[in-house]
């Protein structure tokens, strides 16, 4: 009752290994690391056969098949490259995930290298079987910004791609007769979120309470250069409009808001986020130079009713920008206190502009980002949002523009976006 000699499968072994096998002897067939027992098209770790009474084995010896990790999972905003020839996905094969540069960057500078494990899963030394994350790169325009610029009042055209975070926000309340329509600017923070000033998104019909405009009335344009040609721009409706809960319409304290876009926008040379600053109550240092862009009124003598009667034609057709120095807080406070009226420049604001005037932001630039280049991270950071100024004409002597100090609201912004700050560390100015 002796059974025939057994040949172990290629890349496998049989245990116990004996010269002879008799009735009731059992053999366990297993495969080398990275191989699986294959029997009748079923994969298993081991397979047992038995020597029968009639001197035959209960089953044929199975084969050993190399483990296949199959096609790796798609990475949002990422690419996969195969290290092995013929795009092999079997045991010990290597793949490399990378992000769509220069618009996305891998979180935590991960290598992105995954190896097909003996268990049949793609494994990374740090992340294990989890996929890496591609985060939008921030504050790095595809075009470098020139050092010498003039003003929005008086006009200097921005080249396409200079301010890829710039958003045009159009609010049109069609529930009103006549339709109420206005515009402002905003800054892209991620593929789904726009930062702007709260007063841009507040319904002025209500003064006794601060009520945001209905999200159905908000349209956001990104990648827009010339307002006469919106064909190249990405337009998105709003999924949510979030005003800062403490926004005060008396003095514009806490003038900050967020719009969540209905769908994430594809990033590219003309659509890229700006970086958020560190959480720091001091805000930007006095005399630091910042840039602001906008399609607001570029002629200081245009009245609001002229804008309305001509539609959006008194918007600057082409995006304008200006370079302005941060004004010491005390100087700005004094300049407003000396005016008739209870203008209060709070600790949540900073001022920018020139004593002699001539360069300024204006009506319609509201909500736009005042950006400063951070030498350490080599990125543009949103330090301010165009908030208020006046009451004199834009660009008047000793009438500084007042900006929301974004660094006071970093935690609030992350909280609204639902992202813990640690997860998005690359987006924070270092």
């Amino acid at each position: 009752n002796e059974c025939p000699e057994l040949q172990p499968p290629v890349h496998g072994k049989i245990e116990p290994s004996q010269a002879k096998y008799f009735f009731k002897d059992q053999v366990l067939v297993s495969c080398d690391t990275g191989y699986k027992v294959l029997k009748d098209n079923v994969e298993m770790d081991t397979f047992q056969i038995e020597c029968l009474k009639d001197g035959t084995w209960s089953n044929k010896i199975p084969t050993c098949k190399i483990v296949d990790c199959r096609a790796p999972g798609e990475l949002e905003h990422g690419l996969i490259t195969f290290s092995t020839r013929n795009n092999l996905t079997t045991y010990k094969s290597e793949i490399k995930y990378s992000c769509q540069e220069p618009y996305y960057k891998m979180l935590n500078n991960n290598t992105g290298i995954y190896t097909c494990s003996a268990q049949g899963v793609w494994m990374n030394k740090v992340l294990g079987r989890s996929l890496p994350t591609c985060l939008p790169e921030c504050g790095q325009p595809s075009r470098s910004l020139p050092s010498l610029v003039k003003r929005i009042i008086g006009g200097r055209n921005a080249e396409p791609g200079l301010f890829p975070w710039q958003a045009l926000i159009v609010v049109e309340d069609t529930s009103r007769v006549p339709n109420d329509k206005w515009f402002g600017s905003g800054a892209l923070l991620s593929a789904s979120w726009i930062l702007t000033a709260a007063h841009v998104l507040r319904s002025q019909r209500r003064d006794t309470t601060v009520i945001p405009v209905s999200k159905e009335h908000v349209t956001v344009y990104l990648g827009l250069h010339d307002v006469r040609d919106k064909s190249g721009a990405v337009n998105s409706s709003a999924a949510r409009v979030v005003l800062h809960p403490d926004f005060n319409i008396q003095n514009y304290n806490h003038d900050i808001a967020l719009v969540q876009l209905q769908e994430p926008v594809p990033l590219g040379p003309h659509v890229m986020p700006v970086c958020l600053p560190r959480l720091e109550p001091e805000g930007p240092a006095p005399h630091m130079l910042g840039l602001v862009a906008g399609w607001g009124i570029s002629n200081p003598n245009v009245t609001v009713d002229e804008i309305i009667s001509s539609g959006t034609r008194t918007l600057s057709d082409v995006l304008q920008y200006v370079k302005l120095p941060v004004v010491p807080h005390a100087e700005c406070k004094t300049s407003y206190e000396s005016r008739s009226g209870n203008y209060s420049v709070t600790e949540n604001m900073f001022c920018a502009g020139y004593y002699e005037g001539g360069k300024d932001t204006c009506l319609g630039d509201s909500g736009g980002a005042f950006v400063i280049f951070d030498d350490l991270s080599q990125r543009w950071v949103v330090q301010g949002l165009v908030s208020w100024g006046g009451p004199e004409e834009c660009g008047s002597k000793q009438v500084y523009g007042v900006y929301t100090k974004v660094s006071n609201y970093v935690d609030w912004v992350w909280e609204q976006m639902g992202l813990p700050q640690s997860v998005v560390e690359p987006q924070v100015e270092r």
Epitope: D207, T208, T209, I211, I308
Partner: antibody
Framework: QIQLVQSGPELKTPGETVKISCKAS????????ITWVKQAPGKGLKWMGW????????TYADDFKGRFAFSLETSASTAYLQINNLKNEDTTTYFC?????????WGQGTSVTVSS | DIVMTQAPLTLSVTIGQPASISCKSS???????????LSWLLQRPGQSPKRLIY???KLDSGVPDRFTGSGSGTDFTLKISRVEAEDLGVYYC?????????FGGGTKLEIK
């Protein structure tokens, strides 16, 4: 500190045009709308409409559509009410008041007399 | 248009006594945002109107707490717990919920 100061009394003949000003101070002008209210001698108040000082869009009550126009000069923090083709029944006092729904600060009123 | 009906037309009160003015609207003033945009204003003789109460019951700063506003839906009341000489004038209710916004006809408060 918040004030709305209106222009002085006006004496006009029928068919003429009058433009009343309302200068705001003490707050950010574009943060509140301006509402216009009519008060005939010895009578009650009548809501004429309001203008959004941020967008510049005016809204008129039905009785004030046509000959009445609200406008702004934002750089001067001033709102205007213009009445064209004046009629005798336009003889009244016109008030400007702050807000679309606040009506918390009022101008002193501008008396318009239309007489041939 | 929403009609705002005030009662009484004239109210003669002795100083130190309470007073009550009613304002009824032809439609509910509860807005879709959950707030009721009803205000009370006082116009003293020869002066501009002055807001006393907004959002039905909120007192403006500087307004004495002897004034109270109450009500909901279509029925609203302004009460003065103890009338003083400076309270004389015409009281108006005003709704800011439905376009066109409308004022009540006014209630003249006289001192007996």
């Amino acid at each position: 500190q918040i004030q709305l100061v209106q222009s002085g009394p006006e004496l006009k003949t029928p068919g003429e045009t009058v433009k009343i000003s309302c200068k705001a101070s003490g707050y950010i002008f574009t943060s509140y709308g301006i509402t216009w209210v009519k008060q005939a001698p010895g009578k009650g108040l009548k809501w004429m409409g309001w203008i959004n000082t941020y967008s510049g869009v005016p809204t008129y009550a039905d009785d004030f559509k046509g000959r009445f126009a609200f406008s702004l000069e934002t750089s001067a923090s001033t709102a205007y009410l213009q009445i064209n083709n004046l009629k005798n029944e336009d003889t009244t006092t016109y008030f400007c008041t702050r807000g679309g729904d606040a009506l918390d600060y009022w101008g002193q009123g501008t008396s318009v007399t239309v007489s041939s | 248009d929403i009609v705002m009906t005030q009662a009484p037309l004239t109210l003669s009160v002795t100083i130190g006594q309470p007073a009550s003015i009613s304002c009824k609207s032809s439609q509910s003033l509860l807005d879709s945002d959950g707030k009721t945009y009803l205000s009370w204003l006082l116009q003293r003789p020869g002066q501009s109107p002055k807001r006393l109460i907004y959002l039905v019951s909120k007192l403006d700063s500087g307004v004495p707490d002897r004034f109270t506003g109450s009500g909901s839906g279509t029925d609203f009341t302004l009460k003065i717990s103890r009338v003083e000489a400076e309270d004389l004038g015409v009281y108006y209710c005003w709704q800011g919920t439905h376009f066109p916004y409308t004022f009540g006809g006014g209630t003249k408060l006289e001192i007996k």
